[in-house]
C-alpha cells in the first residue's frame, strides 16, 4: 500500500534493469501528494543500495504484487508463531497449577 510522502519528489532517474525479489530488502511506494504529483517506487536492495523503479513498467507491477504477497505471508507466519507461544504459555501455566494442586 502506498505511503504518503513527506516533502518533494525523490526520484531523478528510474532503474532499467530487472530487480529480483530475492535481492529486495524493502520496497516503498509513495502515493502522489501536493509536494510530488506522481507515484514513486523506491527499492532497497539487500546490499543497502536504494534505487527508483519505473511505476509504469509491467515488470515492476509484477514485482510489487510478489513483494506484497511475501510481506503478508511473513506477517501471517509471525502471527501464527505468536499464537503458538500464547498456547504454550497457557499449557505451562495449567501444568504448574496442576502440580501445585498435587503437592
Amino acid at each position: 500500500t502506498p505511503v504518503v510522502r513527506k516533502g518533494r519528489c525523490s526520484c531523478i532517474s528510474t532503474n532499467q534493469g530487472t530487480i529480483h525479489l530475492q535481492s529486495l530488502k524493502d520496497l516503498k511506494q509513495f502515493a502522489p501528494s501536493p509536494s510530488c504529483e506522481k507515484i514513486e517506487i523506491i527499492a532497497t536492495l539487500k546490499n543497502g543500495v536504494q534505487t527508483c523503479l519505473n511505476p509504469d513498467s509491467a515488470d515492476v507491477k509484477e514485482l510489487i504484487k510478489k513483494w506484497e504477497k511475501q510481506v503478508s505471508q511473513k506477517k501471517k507466519q509471525k502471527n501464527g508463531k505468536k499464537h503458538q507461544k500464547k498456547k504454550v504459555l497457557k499449557v505451562r501455566k495449567s501444568q504448574r497449577s496442576r502440580q501445585k494442586k498435587t503437592t
Partner: antibody
Framework: QVQLVESGGGVVQPGRSLRLSCTAS????????MHWVRQAPGKGLEWVAV????????YYADSVKGRFTISRDNSKNTLYLQMNSLRAEDTAVYYC?????????????????WGQGTTVTVSS | EIVLTQSPGTLSLSPGERATLSCRAS???????LAWYQQKPGQAPRLLIY???SRATGIPDRFSGSGSGTDFTLTISRLEPEDFAVYYC??????????FGPGTKVDIK
C-alpha cells in the same frame, strides 16, 4: 549506441539569450534524469542544473539561478537549457550528461553518459 | 555548502606506478553520494566510480575508490599510458547541488 549530442552554442553579447539543445539516442530518454555541466576555458567542471526523468524535479547552481532554465521534451528525446541575461563568466563548454540509472535522494549513481559539449562565448 | 578539496594538484608518475588521489570534504559526506571522473584533454569527462567505491560499467579493476566521512581516495593500482588525465571527485549535496572538486592532474614523470 548510447549518445548525447549538444547544439546551439555560439558567440553572444552580454545580456542576451541563447538556447542549448541536447539530443539523446540509444536509450530510453524518458527514464533518466539529465544534467548540464560547464567548463570554463582552462578551468574545472561546474555543475549547472539537473532535471528528473519526468521533468518535475529541477535544481540549479546558485550562479545561474533565476537566469537559466532547464527543460526537456521526452517525445523528442531532447534536453534544453535556456540561458538568459548572459554574462562573460558564463563563457564555457557546456556538456549535457545522463544521470545514472535509478538515482534518487538516497543514492547517487553519478553522471554515466556525456555529450562532447558545445561552446558558448559571451563577449561584446 | 560543502566544499571539496583535491590533493595533490598535480601528480607526476611513471607508467606502472601506483597513483593515490585524495578528495577531502569540508563537512561529512555520505559515501552514497560521492563519485569520481576522469577527463582527458579535449574530451568529455568519464564516470569511474560512484557510491565512493562502486566501479562504473566498463571501468578496469585497476581503478578503485574508498573512504567515508570527509576523506575519500581514488587509487590506480598500476598506471597505464591512457590513465594520464585530470581526475575530479564530485558529491551530491543536500541543497541539492552537485559539487565538483578542483581536480588532480596525473602526468607522466
Amino acid at each position: 549506441q548510447v549518445q548525447l549530442v549538444e547544439s546551439g552554442g555560439g558567440v553572444v553579447q552580454p545580456g542576451r539569450s541563447l538556447r542549448l539543445s541536447c539530443t539523446a539516442s540509444g536509450f530510453t530518454f524518458s527514464q533518466y534524469g539529465m544534467h548540464w555541466v560547464r567548463q570554463a576555458p582552462g578551468k574545472g567542471l561546474e555543475w549547472v542544473a539537473v532535471i528528473s526523468y519526468g521533468g518535475d524535479i529541477k535544481y540549479y547552481a546558485d550562479s545561474v539561478k533565476g537566469r537559466f532554465t532547464i527543460s526537456r521534451d521526452n517525445s523528442k528525446n531532447t534536453l534544453y537549457l535556456q540561458m538568459n541575461s548572459l554574462r562573460a563568466e558564463d563563457t564555457a563548454v557546456y556538456y549535457c550528461a545522463r544521470e545514472g540509472e535509478g538515482s534518487n535522494i538516497y543514492y547517487y549513481y553519478g553522471m554515466d553518459v556525456w555529450g562532447q559539449g558545445t561552446t558558448v562565448t559571451v563577449s561584446s | 555548502e560543502i566544499v571539496l578539496t583535491q590533493s595533490p594538484g598535480t601528480l607526476s608518475l611513471s607508467p606502472g606506478e601506483r597513483a593515490t588521489l585524495s578528495c577531502r570534504a569540508s563537512q561529512s559526506v555520505s559515501s552514497s553520494y560521492l563519485a569520481w571522473y576522469q577527463q582527458k584533454p579535449g574530451q568529455a569527462p568519464r564516470l569511474l566510480i560512484y557510491g565512493a567505491s562502486s566501479r562504473a560499467t566498463g571501468i578496469p579493476d585497476r581503478f578503485s575508490g574508498s573512504g567515508s566521512g570527509t576523506d575519500f581516495t581514488l587509487t590506480i593500482s598500476r598506471l597505464e599510458p591512457e590513465d594520464f588525465a585530470v581526475y575530479y571527485c564530485q558529491q551530491y549535496g543536500s541543497s541539492p547541488i552537485f559539487t565538483f572538486g578542483p581536480g588532480t592532474k596525473v602526468d607522466i614523470k
